[in-house]
Interface confidence: low
Amino acid sequence: GDTRPRFLEQVKHECHFFNGTERVRFLDRYFYHQEEYVRFDSDVGEYRAVTELGRPDAEYWNSQKDLLEQKRAAVDTYCRHNYGVGESFTVQRRVYPEVTVYPAKTQPLQHHNLLVCSVNGFYPGSIEVRWFRNGQEEKTGVVSTGLIQNGDWTFQTLVMLETVPRSGEVYTCQVEHPSLTSPLTVEWRARSESAQSKMLSGVGGFVLGLLFLGAGLFIYFRNQKGHSGLQPTGFLS
Amino acid sequence: IKEEHVIIQAEFYLNPDQSGEFMFDFDGDEIFHVDMAKKETVWRLEEFGRFASFEAQGALANIAVDKANLEIMTKRSNYTPITNVPPEVTVLTNSPVELREPNVLICFIDKFTPPVVNVTWLRNGKPVTTGVSETVFLPREDHLFRKFHYLPFLPSTEDVYDCRVEHWGLDEPLLKHWEFDAPSPLPETTENVVCALGLTVGLVGIIIGTIFIIKGVRKSNAAERRGPL
């Protein structure tokens, strides 16, 4: 492969915003490879050598009055300006989450399982995901992947609940996000639809069978009691 | 007090590759970058270009300054080269996977430098190029880099995928595998027993009950025909 030595220069002009644009901090940062060697910080007002490598630049740039005036004004001319230009599609961007709940492992009831609440495609990244069992919040046994940035201005996160599902239990994943006016909830019941229909079929069939049997026996014996004068036809000897 | 938002204009220049990058980052997402060859602004999401504009020529001037600075710094550092930092690679999907439901595989390449990487998608071991897309090199707070590669796909039980990453910090290409994990249905033993027994008992009950009903009705009719003794 290509084994030639590599040399990298990085520059980062950073604008840090607090409480909208009420407080703004501007940083002009220079790096050789990963090492920052000189920076201008609007809180300081001058260039400052971060390592010895940057001392000549700090001293030279600090002697340039016009450059410093430009950098000191950057919180307004650069930071606040760019914030205003991009605000509508960055700061104000809202994309609501898609929420799906499913069991991670396919286990029968009363076995350890992991219920997954998959929250996808939302923006911004600030989100609150909670698990509830029968209306009570579950705080123990909750594991999360943390916030995952998809790189396309959306985020996703998986929040898992370690539990032993029991018949009839209702699990709820509740999501709060700036795009939602009220919390979004998705329920999962501790029995699958096929299992439920099997149970209903079995119980329904059983009840129906008992009804028929009961009705048959009732009709049969009622008629027997009502006509006691009639001798039953016996076997011919 | 934690800041609410951060906008970063990030630039780099790499020698001897003579590759440069100019991009704007908002809270870790790319707003746009400048295509150095085409000398044009490329918006990360198409709609951004409807709200703002950026003169690409300004970025080219900055890159020229970065190149000059790099040459000064290289001499000043006594020609100390960069130390390769190999990437961490993760493959994930854009949303929960359902059979034959379109989805996107994401290959996330993280914590590496220098910003040069070769990424290939493999389906069943063969390179795939249709529909693939990627981001530019994204800055990190520790001044290493991140990058995303995307592959739209239709999940099936037959196909397996790999994201293959080459970097100078790696001794050999790194492959991260992904395949569809088909959930085996729950055994539902109790439900099956209840269903079988219920239906069996029900069926037997219905048959026997019907027989008794018929017999009872017949008996009643016969008695009525004969009349009292």
Epitope: D41, D43, G45, E46, R48, E59, Y60, S63, K65, L68 | -
Partner: antibody
Framework: QVQLKESGPALVKPTQTLTLTCTFS??????????VGWIRQPPGKALEWLAL???????YYSTSLKTRLTISKDTSKNQVVLTMTNMDPVDTATYYC????????????WGQGTLVTVSS | DIVLTQPPSVSGAPGQRVTISCSGS????????VSWYQQLPGTAPKLLIY???QRPSGVPDRFSGSKSGTSASLAITGLQSEDEADYYC?????????FGGGTKLTVLG
Amino acid sequence: QVQLKESGPALVKPTQTLTLTCTFSGFSLSTSGVGVGWIRQPPGKALEWLALIDWDDDKYYSTSLKTRLTISKDTSKNQVVLTMTNMDPVDTATYYCARSPRYRGAFDYWGQGTLVTVSS
Amino acid sequence: DIVLTQPPSVSGAPGQRVTISCSGSESNIGSNYVSWYQQLPGTAPKLLIYDNNQRPSGVPDRFSGSKSGTSASLAITGLQSEDEADYYCQSYDYDHYVFGGGTKLTVLG
């Protein structure tokens, strides 16, 4: 408004350690860029910079006096303390504390000064 | 530790213009800002000029500063009797503040 005031002994014996305190108001030493420095002036002579402490606790000392000086701050009390060991009659001077509003900035506010005499 | 060189004294009649020079090197004045202080007899120094040529509020515009290469100068126009004082230049040398030896300004007559 910004005010600084030096306090400490008026008389120190040779070889003793001098401890001076600068108590200030009207600004905070936790504000980015701010520093508080000490400057002295022997009678009839020029100003001589001694030391400075930054908002982020970086400390800077005069090369010739580095081994004898220690500067520290107590942000909550709005105080900066300078200690100078092994005092000598040549250290007799008026000692001033002053504020620098930003990194490498000028000293925009000064205390009134305190005269320290070194004599046995 | 006097690193910056100033003339020991200058003088001028009321209404005249006087300049005080301050000479340093590449590592101090050459690379950093220069400040000027006025010290009236028996008082603490007062900031007169910062960032080579900037006046704090309250300082009359009769006082001006300039810098060229490794030298700086303070100019006082329309000299007044209350300007009689010691004047010090100050700059920065790597991690150290440096002062000049001071110049005594005498207002004649």
